[in-house]
Amino acid sequence: SPVPPSTALKELIEELVNITQNQKAPLCNGSMVWSINLTAGVYCAALESLINVSGCSAIEKTQRMLNGFCPHKVSAGQFSSLRVRDTKIEVAQFVKDLLVHLKKLFREGQFN
């Protein structure tokens, strides 16, 4: 049976928590990604940013999970207007910011 949206979001949060807690060396070798606007369309925007990081096993599960939340096909090099213009941050900081935002969505009951 399909996973309820609340469970899917909780699983994504859990994965991001695991990444932040288990981080020893710089996440994804310190790769930089485009910062995104967290106020709308967060799942697709996050995927559009993270999909450009390749060869980083630590975030592969996150990429797959975000893909399940995003209704359209996302490919590397694709960017929507949700990108914060010309601002790049480390993947580790991106994950932390995303986690804070998703936890707030969960607490508010915004699962979709």
Partner: antibody, heavy 123, light 107 residues
Amino acid sequence: QVTLKESGPGILQPSQTLSLTCSFSGFSLSTSDMGVDWIRQPSGKGLEWLAHIWWDDVKRYNPALKSRLTISKDTSSSQVFLMLASVDTADTATYYCARTVSSGYIYYAMDYWGQGTSVTVSS
Amino acid sequence: DIQMTQTASSLSASLGDRVTISCRASQDIRNYLNWYQRKPDGTVKLLIFYTSKLHSGVPSRFSGSGSGTDYSLTIRNLEQEDIATYFCQQGNTLPLTFGGGTKLEIK
């Protein structure tokens, strides 16, 4: 040391509004990941979760009682308030407040509880 | 809502015994299961959170286990101070729901 203490009217009449106060110490509701819940237990029955308020004022209610419940907080005075409108004899219970911390995973585990305050609804 | 069922409303055991209290959820709660102890004076304490994590200050004779829908609380070497009612609570989905409680008594 974390402590919570509930206070209320003790007795009130049907159709009135129940106002409860939870006064706490040992933590701050301005701290990220902190929350306070209200739970009640009617005599001889199980525990029932009523409402929750997070540090950033996100509020959640039990859907069965949502239309009658209002939760709020005064961070500076370390208090959380619960109002239950249009009370009936079925609302007679011991009312507890408790702290929730959500560091990392969202646990919804209430790690410290008040002693409870007894509320009787009677005409 | 998720229903939480504690089949035993009361249990009788002797001091020094090993006691297991069970709790069943009406659906998978993914280990978001907490155990509370309510003493006869009304004091409520968290014992175990997230199925098996011991809350600070709780004696190590308390332990929790389970997964999916079935969970249990075990008390080893039962002591007089353990006489209380024990409640399970699911923290996976709102509204939060509790089991009906299991009252532990001394034989």
